[in-house]
């Protein structure tokens, strides 16, 4: 005997109860795939969840955060807080970055500043809580009578401001 | 059915109090840290308060330390917010909502949060 049910498209399903009939899905339910025998509740995004694609016959609701929180894992199935530039999420609250750490982004942890002499560099600029260390030259390339790929500036006579 | 359900909230005068409950259902309380989080007339989502497991353990935001307390019943599988002192600047929607699995270790993320119950402060 064949399978009926295999002919039932996306939206419906297999109503075993009315001799394999194809069923539209009932309201806040949908099926994705064609030969289902029952259809899947939809995903109801409410409180900290906010509706970004309405549930159809054949797809799933899809959610999204509310402003002042940002999206975690698979199809945003949590919502998780943003902190501000400089500070790092902990489970008291948004918490500045450490001396020495810095976060550029609203999420993630504080990262340590670039340790510009491991590379045989030094700090061009200084890290803030918001912004990594810039490194610059190694402190050789800097140093009096180091070769330099730029030509010394002319030399000025002794009591004249640079203009 | 997961499913979580705020009461409580209503029309106070600064100065005054409130205690909102959050009654939780289709789930274990006692298994999940539990937060209370809000949202002002136009503003996003701000978070309020969180408690652990047990109630060992509770974190509040600078802006109610002091005025508010988040406590929990786990054998009535419920959770509550006494806020005291209100002001014009507490009022919002309060959302109870449930730390994700591996909440405290691996992120801060919330899975599930009821409607809200809307808290009004005025004269």
């Known amino acids: 005997l064949q399978d009926l049910c295999s002919n039932c498209p996306a939206g419906t399903f297999c109503d075993n109860n009315r001799s394999q009939i194809c069923s539209p899905c009932p309201p806040n339910s949908f099926s994705s795939a064609g030969g289902q025998r029952t259809c899947d509740i939809c995903r109801q995004c409410k409180g900290v969840f906010k509706t970004r694609k309405e549930c159809s016959s054949t797809s799933n609701a899809e959610c999204d955060c509310i402003s002042g929180y940002h999206c975690l894992g698979a199809e945003c199935s949590m919502c998780e807080q943003d902190c501000k530039q400089g500070q790092e999420l902990t489970k008291k609250g948004c918490k500045d970055c450490c001396f020495g750490t810095f976060n550029d982004q609203k999420r993630g942890i504080c990262r340590p500043w670039t340790n510009c002499s491991l590379d045989g560099k030094s700090v061009l600029v200084n890290g803030t809580k918001e912004r990594d260390v810039v490194c610059g030259p190694s402190p050789a390339d800097l140093s009096p009578g180091a070769s330099s790929a730029t030509p010394p500036a002319p030399a000025r006579e002794p009591g004249h401001s640079p203009q | 059915q997961v499913q979580l359900v705020e009461s409580g909230g209503g029309l106070v005068q600064p100065g005054g109090s409130l205690r909102l409950s959050c009654a939780a259902t289709?789930?274990?309380?006692?298994n999940y840290w539990m937060n209370w989080v809000r949202q002002a007339p136009g503003k996003g989502l701000e978070w309020?308060?969180?408690?652990?497991?047990?109630?060992?353990?509770?974190y509040y935001v600078d802006s109610v330390k002091g005025r508010f307390t988040i406590s929990r019943d786990n054998a009535k599988n419920s959770l509550y917010l006494q806020m005291s002192s209100l002001r014009a600047e507490d009022t919002a929607v309060y959302f109870c909502?449930?730390?994700?699995?591996?909440?405290?270790?691996?992120?801060?993320?919330?899975?599930?949060s009821g409607q809200g119950t809307t808290v009004t402060v005025s004269s």
């Open positions: 289709g789930f274990t309380l006692s």
């Open positions: 909502a449930r730390g994700g699995e591996g909440y405290g270790v691996d992120h801060y993320g919330l899975d599930v």
């Open positions: 309020v308060a969180n408690i652990n497991q047990d109630g060992s353990e509770r």
